[in-house]
């Protein structure tokens, strides 16, 4: 079976369109969200950005690995954007979302 | 299809003896670690602690299940232990050690 | 005690389909991972897949021989875990085995007596 | 063929000590996965001998132990027995998916 790929921060553009939502976004278009994926394997490396918590979970995932799941490969920092939107009474809002962006991934 | 478990907090003790540090940890002699598992699936409800990123991610995933993961169930809030143990000469210490405990969990 | 009952194996031709049962007693049941192994005549233990606790949404996981013509399912409120097989061919002829998975270090610490399925035309 | 290699067969005298290696790979062993072991007499179902590397279960004589080192474990059976006399299997798990593998078995025979 394929061995997976470290825990990292993996490209991604998102489409405002491809989700539907060009109807009440006016910008911009799409952004780069980028999403996090690979395994948390041991040993858990510092790149990996592991917590105290995620290295012991590793260290039982190995011994019971049929109970206990290894770490997740998650964000550990995410940007804001700012959108260009219509609410509900068709107003031009501009409002920042908060945790749109991955910046940076870690097993947790 | 079977009815996926949503992403929550399972109740997990870690004896140190079983990871072999009971050499050098004095006290506690384990502790209630918890770990986060569950599905990250659509719709994301409240009891998920879902990010912005999170939620996006969802629904790029059902769009691009095979190049897309579901976000992943991790700590949102975790805790310290305080740890008596033997330093490398011998000296007995007394440490906090952060993100030991998980008390919540998310999708992320 | 601690008791895991295979039944269901027989006789059945290649392309058949055959629902093997394992019946758990002595245990709170839905608290375990179980899985299946195999043993071909004469020859070593294969492990041919499992399925996880409700907890862990029944998640299943099968070996690579098998997978996409088995099947594991469970019920926990009759304390039985199935093996349905499908597309079975000569290869899979085998004593399976249910096996319990003990909870600290992931140890087959109860086995069933085992259930013989013989592929043959 | 196995994800684990064992030896196909072992014999010692009644008394004598015998040891069966496990021989694995960075993926399961070496990855840090916990190694068992099972003894299967014959006409009968696997039994759990040795889980964790090293601890028994209770009912097995101290006689049995496990090691593992790198990417290979190993069995000792001490002051062999004619009723010791049967299938030894290894087991681990495979990191990138946490699959269950074991080893292809090694038939122990009590000489005399």
């Known amino acids: 079976s394929e061995l997976k790929t470290a825990c990292k921060k993996h490209e991604l553009y998102v489409s405002f369109q491809d989700l539907g939502w060009q109807d009440w976004i006016i910008a911009p278009k799409g952004y780069a969200a980028n999403y996090c994926d690979g395994e948390c394997s041991f040993p858990l490396n510092a790149h990996m950005n592991a917590t105290n918590h995620a290295i012991v979970q590793t260290l039982v995932h190995l011994m019971n690995p049929e109970y206990v799941p290894k770490p997740c490969c998650a964000p550990t920092k995410l940007n804001a954007i700012s959108v260009l939107y219509f609410d509900d009474n068709s107003n031009v809002i501009l409002k920042k979302y908060r945790n749109m962006v991955v910046r940076a991934c870690g097993c947790h | 299809s079977e009815l996926k478990t949503a992403c929550k907090k399972h109740e997990l003790y870690v004896s140190f003896q079983d990871l072999g540090w009971q050499d050098w940890i004095i006290a506690p002699k384990g502790y209630a670690a918890n770990y986060c598992d569950g599905e990250c699936s659509f719709p994301l409800n409240a009891h998920m602690n879902a990010t912005n990123h999170a939620i996006v991610q969802t629904l790029v995933h059902l769009m691009n299940p095979e190049y897309v993961p579901k976000p992943c169930c991790a700590p949102t809030k975790l805790n310290a232990i305080s740890v008596l143990y033997f330093d490398d000469n011998s000296n007995v210490i007394l440490k906090k050690y952060r993100n030991m405990v998980v008390r919540a969990c998310g999708c992320h | 005690q601690v008791q895991l009952v295979e039944s269901g194996g027989g006789l059945v031709k290649p392309g058949g389909s055959l629902r093997l049962s394992c019946a758990a007693s002595?245990?709170?049941?839905?608290?375990?991972?179980v899985h299946w192994v195999r043993q071909a005549p004469g020859k070593g233990l294969e492990w041919v897949g499992r399925?996880?606790?409700?907890?862990?949404?029944?998640?299943?996981m099968y070996a690579a021989p098998v997978k996409g013509r088995f099947t594991i399912s469970r019920d926990d409120s009759k304390n039985t875990l199935y093996l349905q097989m499908n597309s079975l061919k000569t290869e899979d002829t085998a004593v399976y085995y249910c096996?319990?998975?003990?909870?600290?270090?992931?140890?087959?610490?109860?086995w069933g007596q085992g259930t013989l399925v013989t592929v043959s035309s | 063929q196995s994800v684990l290699t064992q030896p196909p067969s072992v014999s010692g005298a009644p008394g004598q000590r015998v040891t069966i290696s496990c021989t694995g790979s960075?993926?399961?062993?070496?990855?840090?996965?916990?190694v068992h072991w099972y003894q299967q007499l014959p006409g009968t179902a696997p039994k759990l001998l040795i889980y964790?590397?090293?601890e028994r279960p209770s009912g097995v004589p101290d006689r049995f132990s496990g090691s593992k080192s790198g990417t290979s474990a190993s069995l000792a059976i001490t002051g062999l027995q004619a009723e010791d006399e049967a299938d030894y299997y290894c087991?681990?798990?495979?990191?990138?998916?946490?699959?269950?593998?074991f080893g292809g078995g090694t038939k122990l025979t009590v000489l005399g």
């Open positions: 964790g590397q090293s």
């Open positions: 960075s993926s399961n062993i070496g990855a840090g996965y916990s």
């Open positions: 087991q681990s798990w495979d990191s990138s998916q946490t699959l269950v593998v």
């Open positions: 096996a319990r998975v003990e909870r600290s270090k992931s140890g087959f610490d109860n």
């Open positions: 002595g245990f709170t049941f839905s608290s375990y991972v």
């Open positions: 399925i996880k606790r409700e907890s862990s949404s029944y998640t299943t």
